[in-house]
């Protein structure tokens, strides 16, 4: 007659005779003048289905009342409610000795639904059911009905159903509605784990342990565990999950981060919105995408806001000193966001004539503290060569620099070395040896540290051992010597000039004068 | 089928007894209370009372003690209604009816065809 | 001892239209009334009884409301059969029934 009604969720109803369409139909026995089905009209003037007697007159009164069979569903423990009204025995004058006011409550599990007989003697006493004080004040018609409530449970229960029985011992009694349920944790989400439905254990005080499983987009962190109580309640979770990358807890789900937020690990965190410099444009987002021109390094975390590479250095200031360089900046403008700043020195020789065409300095130069990597804004260089055009470039780098080399991140200065003493002459040759004469010619130094201003060729006889010298001086890196000796052993040093000095002589060089008059062409250093 | 069974029409002289009888059928007789219900002429309905047909115990209401008198004979189903010393008001139908105890209430669900008893001199 | 004042004396009403009888006691009752029906020459039918319930064969038209001391019989499409002398009564210790109302057809 009326539609399902709502209980507890942790309740679950096997038979509600308040839900029941149409007749009830249970039997009775005796057939007549016992149990009877009546419909009473309740506050909304919808007819309920009751089961009625009232055999207050004769003694030894013994009337039963046996529902439909009642599938178990798996339930070990079932509670019964029943909701009647009893009257009281003073307000039936006449009938003192045979009006009672308690019934017995009976039941019987059966494997077969479809018993057509009560047999007394195969149901099992429940207990004894009485109107206490708690009753319930209900509408029923227009007026106020007291409606007791009584609940009792029985288990553990093992065949398929059960059969439950009402007996009446001779009161005046309304079964208004009769509940079988069974109790079971209900459905739950706790700590990020599904918990399924779970019927309660057979005893009232047994606990049923549950494994959870995580719910979807999150992963275990310790094994997910409850028990389900007698009750129906869950006590002490243990364990949890948690939510993937990409995915916070809302409403006890996992649900991707929304556009503008990332979260790039499965922990508790909520998601959160993408770093300065950063985006990301899908829902889910692990980490967050850097806006053009900047840039993520490998070991900057996901939290971190995307930065650039550093402007140039500014005011870069050189401090020539001979051979060695000095170099000093200011930090850039711009440093990208970042506090790993450092700086690189690049050193390129470049052509006097055309200073386009620049090489790497090499390994010969030094750089005081070091060439790359410098964490302060000053830098010595030495042992460059003299008189020499340099370019330095010095480099201002981050973490991210290597992401976008822009040529913006270095500033340069061009300086020329101061001359000095040129190297020395490192090949002499006697071109021409004649009785009286040697031509030489030899090569200009390696390191000329300077403009060459002339050379200057020392000789002497060679058991004369320098004790008596003669100089030439030439601005050509060749010379004739005359007047010498025939037949003579002389030892020639060339050496280079610049306005910085003479260079070091070059290494001896032996040659012996011819006896005869023809000429002999030589270019070894010990031509005889 | 429940029947409750009474006498034809009495004429009695003022001072005299009558005694109505009303058998049951159709049910156990002592498994339900039985009701007496007077309506004179014209009238409406009086309740008189009511006996318990398990022990006999009746219960009368208030105008009706000492003259009426409720019995019973358990053997035969039959309840009976006694008044004596009759008088000219007493001129009435007079029905049976069986009581139906309810936990929401009574009511006489089975009535008696009524005995018609007439006082006259 | 509770008395039981029904109103109207006389209802004049045609077939189809609805009736509706009240029974108001002397103070309030915790249950509701009974109600019958007599016609001519029969004896009373028990139409309603504890908690609204109708009687044994008695049409869903009859139905009755009420608590305290205000009790009302509706008859909600009033049938040929219908005209008749309908009483209220209030049990308890002590019963008593109500003078009656006559429905008649107008």
């Known amino acids: 007659v009326t539609g399902s009604r709502v209980y507890p969720a942790n309740e679950v109803t096997l038979l509600d005779s308040r839900s029941v369409q149409g007749e009830l139909g249970w039997i009775a026995s005796p057939l007549e003048g016992g149990w009877e089905e009546v419909s009473i009209m309740d506050e909304k003037n919808t007819p309920i289905r009751t089961y009625q007697v009232c055999n207050v007159m004769e003694p030894s009164q013994n009337n039963w009342l046996r529902t439909d069979w009642i599938t178990r569903e798996g339930a070990q423990r079932v509670y019964i409610e029943i909701k009647f009204t009893l009257r009281d025995c003073n307000s039936l004058p006449g009938v003192m000795g045979t009006c009672k006011e308690t019934f017995n409550l009976y039941y019987y599990e059966s494997d077969n639904d479809k018993e057509r007989f009560i047999r007394e003697n195969q149901f099992v006493k429940i207990d004894t059911i009485a109107a206490d004080e708690s009753f319930t004040q209900v509408d029923i018609g227009d007026r106020i009905m007291k409606l007791n409530t009584e609940i009792r449970d029985v288990g553990p229960l093992s065949k398929k159903g059960f059969y439950l029985a009402f007996q009446d011992v001779g009161a005046c009694i309304a079964l208004v509605s009769v509940r079988v349920f069974y109790k079971k944790c209900p459905l739950t989400v706790r700590n990020l784990a599904q918990f399924p439905d779970t019927i309660t254990g057979a005893d009232t005080s047994s606990l049923v342990e549950v494994r959870g499983s995580c719910v979807n987009n999150s992963e275990e962190k310790d094994v997910p565990k409850m028990y389900c109580g007698a009750d129906g309640e869950w006590l002490v979770p243990i364990g949890n999950c948690l939510c993937n990358a990409g995915h916070e807890e809302r409403s006890g789900e996992c649900q991707a981060c929304k556009i503008g937020y990332y979260k790039a690990l499965s922990t508790d965190a909520t998601c959160a919105k993408c770093p300065p410099h950063s985006y990301s444009v899908w829902e889910g987002a692990t980490s967050c995408t850097c806006d053009r021109g900047f840039f993520r390094a490998d070991n900057d975390a996901a939290s971190m806001p995307c930065t650039r590479p550093p402007s140039a250095p500014l005011n870069l200031i050189s401090n020539v000193n001979e051979t060695s360089v000095n170099l000093e900046w200011s930090s850039p403008q711009n440093t990208g966001g970042r506090q790993d700043i450092s700086y690189n020195v690049v050193c390129k020789k470049c052509g006097a004539g055309d200073p386009s065409k620049c090489r790497p300095c090499g390994s010969g130069v030094h750089y005081t503290p070091q060439q790359n990597g410098l964490k302060t804004t000053k830098v010595s260089i030495t042992d460059l060569l003299a008189h020499t055009n340099y370019t330095f470039e010095i480099w201002a780098v981050n973490g991210v620099s290597k992401y976008n080399p822009n040529p913006d991140q270095s500033v340069s200065v061009t300086v020329t070395t101061n001359q000095a003493a040129p190297s020395s002459i490192a090949l002499v040759q006697a071109k021409e040896v004649t009785r009286y004469s040697v031509a030489l010619a030899w090569l200009e130094p390696d390191r000329p540290n300077g403009v060459i201003l002339e050379y200057e060729v020392k000789y002497y006889e060679k058991d004369q051992n320098e004790r008596s010298y003669r100089i030439v001086r030439t601005a050509a890196r060749n010379t004739d010597i005359k007047g010498l000796n025939p037949l003579t052993s002389y030892v020639f040093h060339v050496r280079a000039r610049t306005a910085a000095g003479y260079g070091d002589f070059s290494e001896p060089l032996e040659v012996t004068t011819n006896t005869v008059p023809s000429r002999i062409i030589g270019d070894g250093a010990n031509s005889t | 089928q429940v029947q409750l069974l009474q006498s034809g029409a009495e004429v009695k002289k003022p001072g005299a007894s009558v005694k109505v009888p009303c058998k049951a059928s159709g049910y156990t007789f002592t498994s339900r209370a039985m009701s007496w219900v007077r309506q004179a002429p014209g009238q409406g309905l009086e309740w008189m009372g009511w006996i318990n047909t398990n022990t006999g115990n009746p219960t009368y209401a208030q105008g009706f003690t000492g003259r009426f008198v409720f019995s019973l004979d358990t053997s035969v189903s039959t309840a009976y209604l006694q008044i004596s010393s009759l008088k000219a008001e007493d001129t009435a139908v007079y029905y049976c009816a069986r009581v139906r105890f309810t936990v929401y209430g009574d009511g006489m669900d089975v009535w008696g065809q009524g005995t018609l008893v007439t006082v006259s001199s | 001892e509770i008395v039981l004042t029904q109103s109207p004396a006389t209802l004049s009403v045609s077939p189809g239209e609805r009736a509706t009888l009240s029974c108001r006691a002397s103070?309030?009752?915790?249950?509701?009334p009974a109600w019958y029906q007599q016609k001519p020459g029969q004896a009373p039918r028990l139409l309603i009884y504890g908690a609204s319930t109708r009687a044994t064969g008695i049409p869903d038209r009859f139905s009755a409301s009420g608590s305290g001391t205000d009790f009302t019989l509706t008859i909600s499409r009033v049938e040929p059969e219908d005209f008749a002398v309908y009483y209220c009564q209030q049990y308890g210790p002590s019963w008593t029934f109500g003078q009656g109302t006559k429905v008649e057809i107008k």
């Open positions: 103070q309030s009752v915790s249950s509701n």
